[in-house]
C-alpha cells in the first residue's frame, strides 16, 4: 500500500482552478526527492505534466505549478483555466513515475453551470460588489420590479422598486432602473457575504405576464495563497483589494478560534503585542494596495492570515479580503542569532546580523524600528559608508566576520537606544532579522577618559583600562570614520590600577598620537575582540587645539572623565560616554555576554537567543 495520500476525486467546472494537496510521510529522503503529477494513459503509463524539478508540460504552460512543503510532508499542484479536456485519471507521487509511491486522483471537469437552465451565474469574491441585470419587456416597464432569493422552497423578497429592502441587505443594496431606452433594471449588492450566495429571481410585473430571470450568485471565500518561509526569516503579505476601498481602513488579521480573526496590524494604529518591533505596514498606493512585512518569524506565527478593508479596521461580515496560509519552516537556513542584546548606559553592544551568504556583495543596512502609526524603520547605517548624523562616532557596520554574518557596533549607549533594530540587505528580503536592545543597570567594563584635548604638534597618550575578564581577548584602538574603524598602534602598559578586586590580568593599553595634526581630531574607540568577533568598545572624542605650552600630554582617567550623563559642552560635541560591545562568539553559543552600555555608571550586557528567559550579565 502506497503511503501517499490525497483526494480520490476532484470535481470542478470549466474555467476554474483546482488546488490538489498530496500528503507523504515527511522522512528526510521523501522531503527532498522529486515530486510529480502525471496523467494516466489508457495503456497504463503515466505522462508527467509537472514536477518539482522544474518540468512543466506544454499542456500546463502558464497555468499550473507544483509547490513542495517539506515541513508538512505535503506538495500542492495548482491547475488553472480548467477545460473538459483536463478530465481524467492522474497520479501524484514521489520519485519515479513507475515506482508505485503514488496516489490515484480522478479529476472531472464539467461544463459551467452558467450554460444551464437560462440561469445567469455570478461568481464574485467575498466582500466585493455584484450587479444582477434583469431584462423586461415594454408592457412591464411601468410595473413593479423586484428581486427574490430562494430560501429552501420559498422565494423571499430582497428588494423592490417600491422602496422595500430586506433587513439582511440594509445599507448595501440598491435597485437601479435604466433610462427609458433600455428595458433593463439592475440590482447592485455591495459588501457581499457568504450568506448572500444562492438562487435569485428577478421579476418585472406581478401577473402571469411578468418577466422573470434566474440568477445564481456564488460568493467565493478566497482560497488562501500558500506561503512557506523560514523560521527567523521574514514574510511580506501584498494586499491588493481594489481602488473602491482605497479610502477605507486596512487590516491584517490572523484567524484564531472559530470565526475570530485577531488584528495583527491596521491603519488605525492597532498592533498586536506579539508583533511589536517586527512588523511594518507599508503605506498604501493610490489604488488601495498595501503590504505588511513581518520579521523574526516564530513557529507560532504559522496560520491563516487575512487582509481586508473595513472602517472598523478589523474583519467584519462583508469585508473584501485576501487570504494566506503561512507555514514556518523550522529547518531554517537562517542561523540562530540573539533576539535580545543587553547593555548598560555608557557602554556598547555588538550585534551579529545574518545575511544570505550567496549575496556577500549586497549592501548591508541597520535600521531602528519605530512603532508610531503603522511602523517604520529609518536607516541608521549602511555598508557603503553612510551613517545617520546623530550616530556619528558611536555606530559602525563591519563586514566582519563575513561568510553570512556582519557586525553592527553601537556605543555611548543611553536609555534612548533601547528598542528594536532590523538587520537587512538590498538582496534577499527574506533575511530581514530583528534584535531588541535593552539597557540594563551596571557599569561599562572598559574605562576611558570622557573627553580629551590634544595640542597641535605635540604627543597625546590616551589610556584605556581593560578589566581582567578580558585577559584572553585582543585589545585594540582604532579611529572611527563612516566606513568603519581603522586600527591604530597601541601600547600595553601593564596592569591597570582602575579596577577594585582585579588582579594582574587587568591591562592598561594606551593610544599614542605623535606630532598631533588637525587630521587627528575625531572619535577613537578602544575595544576587545577575538578574531573577527567583536566585544565591548569605549569611545573618546579627541579635540585638537593650538599650542599653549610645550610638552606632551598624558591623559588620565581622573582628569578627563566626564560625569554620568554630563554634556561635554566645551568640546562642542555630544556627551562622551564609555561603551563596550558584546562578544559575538558568545552570541553563537547563546550564553550570557559581558557587555557595557550607555550610562556612565555602566553595566555588563548579555544576550538572549530567542528564549523568553533573559540572561543576566554576570562577569566570566
Amino acid at each position: 500500500k502506497s503511503p501517499i495520500f490525497g483526494p480520490e476525486e476532484v470535481n470542478s467546472v470549466e474555467g476554474n482552478s483546482v488546488s490538489i494537496t498530496c500528503y507523504y510521510p515527511p522522512t528526510s529522503v521523501n522531503r527532498h526527492t522529486r515530486k510529480y503529477w502525471c496523467r494516466q494513459g489508457a495503456r497504463g503509463g503515466c505522462i508527467t505534466l509537472i514536477s518539482s524539478e522544474g518540468y512543466v508540460s506544454s499542456k500546463y504552460a502558464g497555468r499550473a505549478n507544483l509547490t513542495n512543503f517539506p515541513e508538512n510532508g505535503t506538495f500542492v499542484v495548482n491547475i488553472a483555466q480548467l477545460s473538459q479536456d483536463d478530465s481524467g485519471r492522474y497520479k501524484c507521487g514521489l520519485g519515479i513515475n513507475s515506482r508505485g509511491l503514488s496516489f490515484d486522483v480522478s479529476l472531472e471537469v464539467s461544463q459551467g453551470p452558467g450554460l444551464l437552465n437560462d440561469t445567469k451565474v455570478y461568481t464574485v469574491d467575498l466582500g466585493r460588489t455584484v450587479t444582477i441585470n434583469c431584462p423586461f419587456k415594454t408592457e412591464n416597464a411601468q410595473k413593479r420590479k423586484s428581486l427574490y432569493k430562494q430560501i429552501g422552497l420559498y422565494p423571499v423578497l430582497v428588494i423592490d422598486s417600491s422602496g422595500y429592502v430586506n433587513p439582511n441587505y440594509t445599507g448595501r443594496i440598491r435597485l437601479d432602473i435604466q433610462g427609458t431606452g433600455q428595458l433593463l433594471f439592475s440590482v447592485v449588492i455591495n459588501q457581499l457575504r457568504l450568506s448572500d450566495a444562492g438562487q435569485y429571481l428577478c421579476q418585472a410585473g406581478d401577473d402571469s405576464n411578468s418577466n422573470k430571470k434566474n440568477a445564481d450568485l456564488q460568493v467565493l471565500k478566497p482560497e488562501p495563497e500558500l506561503v512557506y518561509e523560514d523560521l527567523r526569516g521574514s514574510v511580506t503579505f501584498h494586499c491588493a483589494l481594489g481602488p473602491e476601498v482605497a479610502n477605507v481602513a486596512k487590516f491584517l488579521c490572523r484567524q484564531s478560534s472559530g470565526e475570530n480573526c485577531d488584528v495583527v496590524v491596521n491603519t488605525l494604529g492597532k498592533r498586536a503585542p506579539a508583533f511589536e518591533g517586527r512588523i511594518l505596514l507599508n503605506p498604501q498606493d493610490k489604488d488601495g494596495s498595501f503590504s505588511v512585512v513581518i520579521t523574526g518569524l516564530r513557529k507560532e506565527d504559522a496560520g491563516r492570515y487575512l487582509c481586508g478593508a473595513h472602517s472598523d479596521g478589523q474583519l467584519q461580515e462583508g469585508s473584501p479580503i485576501q487570504a494566506w496560509q503561512l507555514f514556518v519552516n523550522e529547518e531554517s537556513t537562517i542561523p540562530r542569532s540573539p533576539t535580545v542584546v543587553k547593555g548598560v548606559a555608557g557602554g556598547s553592544v555588538a550585534v551579529l546580523c545574518p545575511y544570505n551568504r550567496k549575496e556577500s556583495k549586497s549592501i548591508k543596512y541597520w535600521c531602528l524600528w519605530e512603532g508610531a502609526q503603522n511602523g517604520r524603520c529609518p536607516l541608521l547605517v549602511d555598508s557603503e559608508g553612510w551613517v545617520k548624523a546623530q550616530y556619528e562616532g558611536r555606530l559602525s557596520l563591519l563586514e566582519e566576520p563575513g561568510n553570512g554574518t556582519f557586525t553592527v557596533i553601537l556605543n555611548q549607549l543611553t536609555s534612548r537606544d533601547a528598542g528594536f533594530y532590523w538587520c537587512l540587505t538590498n538582496g534577499d528580503t527574506l533575511w530581514r532579522t530583528t534584535v531588541e536592545i535593552k539597557i540594563i543597570e551596571g557599569e561599562p567594563n572598559l574605562k576611558v577618559p570622557g573627553n580629551v584635548t590634544a595640542v597641535l604638534g605635540e604627543t597625546l597618550k590616551v589610556p584605556c583600562h581593560f578589566p581582567c575578564k578580558f585577559s584572553s581577548y585582543e585589545k585594540y584602538w582604532c579611529k572611527w570614520n563612516n566606513t568603519g574603524c581603522q586600527a591604530l598602534p597601541s601600547q600595553d602598559e601593564g596592569p591597570s590600577k582602575a579596577f577594585v578586586n582585579c588582579d594582574e590580568n587587568s591591562r592598561l593599553v594606551s593610544l599614542t598620537l605623535n606630532l598631533v595634526t588637525r587630521a587627528d581630531e575625531g572619535w577613537y574607540w578602544c575595544g576587545v575582540k577575538q578574531g573577527h568577533f567583536y566585544g565591548e568598545t569605549a569611545a573618546v572624542y579627541v579635540a585638537v587645539e593650538e599650542r599653549k605650552a610645550a610638552g606632551s600630554r598624558d591623559v588620565s582617567l581622573a582628569k578627563a572623565d566626564a560625569a554620568p550623563d554630563e554634556k561635554v559642552l566645551d568640546s562642542g560635541f555630544r556627551e562622551i560616554e564609555n561603551k563596550a560591545i558584546q562578544d559575538p562568539r558568545l552570541f553563537a553559543e547563546e550564553k550570557a555576554v559581558a557587555d557595557t552600555r550607555d550610562q556612565a555608571d555602566g553595566s555588563r550586557a548579555s544576550v538572549d537567543s530567542g528564549s523568553s528567559e533573559e540572561q543576566g550579565g554576570s562577569s566570566r
Epitope: 483526494p7 476532484v10 470542478s12 476554474n16 483546482v18 490538489i20 461568481t123 457568504l194
Partner: nanobody, 128 residues
Framework: EVQLVESGGGLVQAGGSLRLSCAAS????????VGWFRQAPGKEREFVAH???????????YYGDFVKGRFTISRGTAKNTVYLQMNSLKPEDTAVYYC??????????????????WGQGTLVTVSS
C-alpha cells in the same frame, strides 16, 4: 454555538446499505469541509471520508484506505448537510460514526486534531 448532528445509523445485514446524514446548525457555522470518522469498540477513531468544497463549484473527496469504492461522501443541496452513502457493508464496518468540521483551513484531513466541531455519533451495526 455550532452543532453537528448525525443520523441514519442502525442495524443492517452484511452486504446491505445505509445512508448517514450530518446536519450542521449554528449561526457561526461557515465551514467548507466536513469529515466522517468511525470508532469501533476498543479501537482508535479512524478516518473514513472527507469532503471539501469551494464557492466556485469545485469539490474534493478523500477516503480512508479501507473504503475501496464502497462509500461515497456528498454534500446536500441545503449546503449544511453532508451524507455518507455506505454500500456493501461488512461486519467489520460496525462502529459509531462521527461527523466533524474544522473552524478554518485544514492540514491533513485524516487527522482528528484538524477538526474543531464533532457530532455525538450514530451507531452502525452490521450483522453477518
Amino acid at each position: 454555538e455550532v452543532q453537528l448532528v448525525e443520523s441514519g445509523g442502525g442495524l443492517v445485514q452484511a452486504g446491505g446499505s445505509l445512508r448517514l446524514s450530518c446536519a450542521a446548525s449554528g449561526r457561526t457555522f461557515s465551514s467548507d469541509a466536513v469529515g466522517w470518522f468511525r470508532q469501533a469498540p476498543g479501537k482508535e477513531r479512524e478516518f473514513v471520508a472527507h469532503i471539501h468544497w469551494s464557492g466556485d463549484f469545485t469539490t474534493y473527496y478523500y477516503y480512508g484506505d479501507f473504503v475501496k469504492g464502497r462509500f461515497t461522501i456528498s454534500r446536500g443541496t441545503a449546503k449544511n448537510t453532508v451524507y455518507l452513502q455506505m454500500n456493501s457493508l461488512k461486519p467489520e464496518d460496525t462502529a459509531v460514526y462521527y461527523c466533524a468540521a474544522p473552524k478554518g483551513a485544514i492540514g491533513d484531513p485524516r487527522s482528528t486534531r484538524e477538526y474543531d466541531y464533532w457530532g455525538q455519533g450514530t451507531l452502525v451495526t452490521v450483522s453477518s
